[in-house]
């Protein structure tokens, strides 16, 4: 069953009500590096895009290297995931209201293209972590996320034995792994070449229309 975006009628070209998002999408010429594909229409500012590329950025004080240095090939997927989260104006159909101190809305069950999830897992499964859900349960006493007492660092593969375990479990089901492939117009691409436009616009239109039918 498809979730409805609670209390939202505007499912297309919208920004989520969260910590760093703009209230309205629009062009951002100076989006940094991996966030640059969204520069024609974005929910993030240039400074947000710059900051999220840093290790333990001030956006969330989140440390990717909580179990030693994360492999660069792995880290780029987390940066891309954060770009999608902060910058995409095409995730309206999956916005849900939440009662959290730091944000009023979140994404739920965004249908991530299966290849994007597979590649993320392949590039990360030898890096190390200590948790299978990164939304909660950290030790924040130092101001930065640390492994909670007794949580052992092991390979990603130990905590995320399959690609779906990673993509769906990591952020409490913000994503679900789609059966559709990149370019199908039926799944959200974390990675895309903006020279061909943003393929996620078509995906959002499809799911928004399907939701209005239900």
């Amino acid at each position: 069953t498809m979730c409805s975006a609670q209390d939202r009628t505007d499912l297309l070209n919208v920004c989520m009500d969260a910590k760093h998002h703009k209230t309205k999408p629009g062009p951002e010429d100076k989006l940094h590096d991996q966030c640059s594909p969204w520069k024609k229409n974005a929910c993030c500012t240039a400074s947000t895009s710059q900051e999220l590329h840093k290790d333990t950025s001030r956006l969330y004080n989140f440390n990717w290297d909580h179990c030693g240095k994360m492999e660069p090939a792995c880290k780029r997927h987390f940066i891309q995931d954060t770009c999608l989260y902060e910058c995409s104006p095409n995730l309206g159909p999956w916005i849900q209201q939440v009662n959290q101190s730091w944000r009023k809305e979140r994404f739920l069950d965004v249908p991530l293209c299966k290849e994007d999830c597979q590649r993320w897992w392949e590039d990360c499964h030898t890096s190390h972590t200590c948790k299978s859900n990164w939304h909660r349960g950290w030790d924040w006493t130092s101001g930065v996320n640390k492994c909670p007492a007794g949580a052992l660092c092991r390979t990603f593969e130990s905590y995320f034995p399959t690609p779906a375990a990673l993509c769906e479990g990591l952020w409490s089901h913000s994503y679900k792994v789609s059966n559709y492939s990149r370019g199908s117009g039926r799944c959200i691409q974390m990675w895309f070449d903006s020279a061909q436009g943003n393929p996620n616009e078509e995906v959002a239109r499809f799911y928004a229309a399907a939701m209005h039918v239900n």
Epitope: C67, G68, C147, L152, C153, R154, T155, S158
Partner: antibody, heavy 118, light 109 residues
Framework: EVQLVQSGAEVKKPGASVKVSCKAS????????MHWVRQAPGQRLEWMGW????????KYSQKFQGRVTITRDTSASTAYMELSSLRSEDTAVYYC???????????WGQGTLVTVSS | SSELTQDPAVSVALGQTVRITCQGD??????ANWYQQKPGQAPVLVIY???NRPSGIPDRFSGSSSGNTASLTITGAQAADEADYYC???????????FGGGTKLTVLG
């Protein structure tokens, strides 16, 4: 650079105890499990047990249960393995090894030879 | 039972491919890890998990598994590969670990 440095060789009499140390450096000691594995001369590797260096929880092989005690000192980033009631068959090289995935040991100590002889 | 069984000895001609196997019930639900050990040295992890090589391990080493059998394959064996090879596996009940008996690999020629 990750390193596990073990204490030196020991000669013990039957019935005595031995305590081998393993000092870790180059990583956050409390974030990983440390296992102990031994190898008698010309024999296979034999798993003895492990300690969660973060909370001190231990698991031991049934073969050594009651005779082996694994501990750690987080302030010194050091794990210890104590084996009691030694017998000649305990003559072996004892290794500590860092665990990265339920039995995947990516770094090993250099080994400590314990000789049990009357 | 939580035993892992390996052939005691295997030989291969220089440059040829060799497969070393490890059998045991625990391998139906857990991956095997593979270690290389040369005389007088500590073991070295060569393959772990699904088929992961630690950095510094040549890509001629690969791992696979089917049912209750795990295999270590060395494609194009070198003289430097002559060593004892051990498999190990997690035993899910109780988070224990078990080692195989080891396979002595001889590289001929």
């Amino acid at each position: 650079e990750v390193q596990l440095v073990q204490s030196g060789a020991e000669v013990k009499k039957p019935g005595a105890s031995v305590k081998v140390s393993c000092k870790a450096s180059g990583y956050t000691f409390t974030s990983y499990a440390m296992h102990w594995v031994r190898q008698a001369p010309g024999q296979r590797l034999e798993w003895m047990g492990w300690i969660n260096a973060g909370n001190g929880n231990t698991k031991y092989s049934q073969k050594f249960q009651g005779r082996v005690t694994i501990t750690r000192d987080t302030s010194a980033s050091t794990a210890y393995m104590e084996l009691s009631s030694l017998r000649s068959e305990d003559t072996a090289v004892y290794y500590c090894a860092r665990d990265i995935s339920y039995g995947s040991f990516d770094y090993w100590g250099q080994g400590t030879l314990v000789t049990v002889s009357s | 039972s939580s035993e892992l069984t390996q052939d005691p000895a295997v030989s291969v001609a220089l440059g040829q491919t060799v497969r070393i196997t490890c059998q045991g019930d625990s391998l139906r639900s857990n991956y095997a890890n593979w270690y290389q050990q040369k005389p007088g040295q500590a073991p070295v992890l060569v393959i772990y998990g699904q088929n992961n090589r630690p950095s510094g391990i040549p890509d001629r080493f690969s791992g696979s598994s089917s049912g209750n059998t795990a295999s270590l394959t060395i494609t194009g064996a070198q003289a430097a590969d002559e060593a004892d090879y051990y498999c190990d596996s997690r035993v899910s009940t109780g988070n224990h670990v078990v080692f195989g008996g080891g396979t002595k690999l001889t590289v001929l020629g």
